[in-house]
């Protein structure tokens, strides 16, 4: 008994085509490009039906359904626009991802096409979502401030500034939406006792009750740092449990470009902010900042040979800043904060130093502030972030 003549589904064809199909004869269904074999909603790799003894086919003919990539996945800190037509998600449809302007940028052009494999695909063949990277180094601050010899910061001046509260007050700098750069000595002992580290952002007043809270997922202290044996390699990274939302009051500081060294020569002016001790000897209530010039490395090393700081010496991994006569400095409580510089070419601020150590007598004459030289640690920073 022959089986009924099979009918090709729309957008598909049957092979082989025969005058009649009898017992054990078979046919296969093939779809046009951009269409897929579907049985229900499950994609089929291939379809072959066999004519049975009772004159029926052993399985129903599938459909050739246009490839549908489905609604594109949500883009964190961005959105998607349908280019082909409202909510059109089928084969060859085009969508455009874009990031929330001002605070995020996209590395690619964000254009995706629904391809024959059923996935939204970028012009580079990538099937993963584009990434909205936080903009870094934007500030409302204009140079001209005088922490010791400092003045209060205004909203948006230092959006990368992070307050670290533990047994002591310290600081850090946001360098990604989920990474904070700080001094190793500020978080020493916190790699295991992370729950005791309270991380606050988006504030000016140290005791403010309104702030963005973050918690550490991991703390990485530079392997070359030895606690209590000087401050060489005084650098650490804190991985946050959750990404923070970037806005005008919370934004990462840029890491230095290769050309940054030329912007951090002797007498070039950097800016440091913090809630550390002021001239009155108390922690600052409001975030304070000071503009301070870079000091010649040899001059700084010599100054600390004359008036040594117990157990510490100036190394090639440090840079110094301050005035010969004193009066402008960072102090206890500022540790881990960023010494930042304006990149004239990009008009973005970048971190050149991390508040590390200095004379007990903050702001004293020839008692310069000593900062971890960030340019020496870019490979270390990138290695940890990329491999986490």
């Amino acid at each position: 008994q022959p089986c009924p003549d099979p009918t090709a589904p729309p957008n598909g064809h049957i092979s082989p085509v025969q005058a009649t199909y009898v017992l054990k004869d078979s046919f296969s269904v093939f779809c046009k490009t951009g269409f897929e074999l579907l049985q229900g909603s499950v994609p089929l790799k291939s379809f072959t039906a066999v004519c049975q003894k009772d004159g029926s086919w052993d399985r129903p003919i599938p459909e050739c359904s246009i490839i549908d990539c489905g609604p594109p996945d949500d883009l964190p800190n961005g959105h998607v626009d349908y280019i082909t037509g409202p909510e059109v998600t089928t084969y060859k449809a085009v969508i455009q991802y874009s990031c929330e302007e001002t605070f995020y940028t996209m590395s690619s052009n964000g254009k995706y096409v629904c391809e024959a494999d059923g996935f939204w695909t970028s012009s580079k063949g990538e099937k993963s979502l584009p990434v909205c990277k936080p903009v870094c180094g934007l500030s409302t601050h204009t140079s001209g401030g005088r922490i010791i010899g400092g003045q209060p910061a205004k909203p948006g001046d230092f959006p990368w500034q992070v307050l670290l509260l533990g047994e002591t007050t310290a600081a850090g700098a946001l360098i990604h939406d989920d990474w904070v750069l700080t001094a190793a000595h500020a978080v020493y002992g916190k790699t295991e006792a992370m729950s005791s580290l309270d991380i606050r952002m988006g504030i000016l007043k140290r005791l403010s009750l309104i702030y963005t809270q973050a918690w550490p997922e991991a703390v990485f202290i530079h392997e070359g740092y030895t606690h209590g044996a000087g401050f060489d390699n005084d650098i650490a990274l804190i991985k946050l449990k959750n990404k923070v939302t970037i806005n005008r009051n919370i934004m990462p500081i840029c890491l230095p470009r290769k050309e940054a060294a030329s912007l951090m020569k002797t007498d070039f002016v950097g800016t440091v902010a913090g809630w550390g001790l002021t001239q009155k000897g108390f922690l600052a209530r409001n975030l304070m900042f000071v503009d301070i010039p870079i000091v010649d490395h040899q001059k700084c090393a010599t100054a600390y040979t004359k008036q040594p700081y117990p157990g510490a010496k100036v190394t090639v991994n440090m840079l110094c800043a301050g005035l010969d006569r004193g009066g402008k400095d960072s102090c206890r409580g500022d540790a881990g904060g960023a010494l930042v510089f304006l990149d004239n070419e990009t008009q973005r601020w970048f971190v050149g130093g991390i508040v590390s150590w200095g004379s007990i007598n903050c702001g004293g004459s020839e008692q310069y502030g000593v900062y971890t030289k960030v340019t020496n640690y870019i490979p270390w920073i990138e290695n940890i972030i990329n491999n986490f």
């Epitope: 229900g40 909603s41 499950v42 790799k45 291939s46 489905g70 949500d74 059923g118």
Partner: antibody, heavy 118, light 107 residues
């Protein structure tokens, strides 16, 4: 960001009915050829597919459990619900909900451990 | 429900190639999917539709499928690849998982 989260009781008595809810975000339950599957994994054992529901409302169930399972979706709440009647201690497992796309299960919830015991 | 059979365990030295098989009747006529599951974690899709790799999955993972056997190959196996691996296929409109293979990366 595509996420799926299972919720429901952690302890069920034998013969009772288990109701599990999967709340999804980052994709649509009503458009595209996407589906949500329920899969379970008894402690120390292999994965076991239970049921799925597609955006077209097409449903399918594990043959051996078909009489005990019901899957449904509430698009407005972004939820998929699985009910399993007449629970037995052998049904003790971690229950996962997951998204189906292009036939593959590409996003999974964190799973919820359901213990059946009197 | 049809059965997909996997070897219970596979051992491999770091940097070597691990091959995990999945056998089922006329499996090559269907799409095969592979999942990695680490202890205490949800499974992760590593190969879809026989040989396609989702974004974020390293290039050392590859797949093939013909006849009655699908194979997941991990080239240059790393310690982090130690996990349980499951194959999956569709039989009409029901999903079937394999019996699972524990991959051990020798120290």
């Amino acid at each position: 960001q595509v996420t799926l989260k299972e919720s429901g009781p952690v302890l069920v008595k034998p013969t009772e009915t288990l109701t599990l809810t999967c709340t999804v975000s980052g994709f649509s339950l009503s458009r595209g050829k996407m589906g949500v599957s329920w899969i379970r994994q008894p402690p120390g054992k292999a994965l076991e597919w239970l049921a799925h529901i597609f955006s077209s409302d097409e449903k399918s169930y594990r043959t051996s459990l078909k009489s005990r399972l019901t899957i449904s979706k509430d698009t407005s709440k972004n939820q998929v619900v699985l009910t399993m009647t007449n629970m037995d201690p052998v049904d003790t497992a971690t229950y996962y909900c997951a998204r189906i796309r292009a036939g593959g299960i590409d996003y999974w919830g964190q799973g919820t451990l359901v213990t059946v015991s009197s | 429900q049809p059965v997909l059979t996997q070897p219970p365990s596979v051992s491999v030295s770091p940097g070597q190639t691990a091959s995990i098989t999945c056998s089922g009747d006329k499996l090559g006529d269907k799409f095969a999917y592979w999942y990695q599951q680490k202890p205490g974690h949800s499974p992760v899709l590593v190969i879809y539709q026989d040989n396609k790799r989702p974004s974020g999955i390293p290039g050392r993972f590859s797949g093939s499928n013909s006849g009655n056997t699908a194979t997941l190959t991990i080239s240059g196996t790393q310690a982090m690849d130690e996990a349980d691996y499951y194959c999956q296929a569709w039989d009409s409109s029901t999903a079937v998982f394999g019996t699972g293979t524990k991959v051990t990366v020798l120290a």
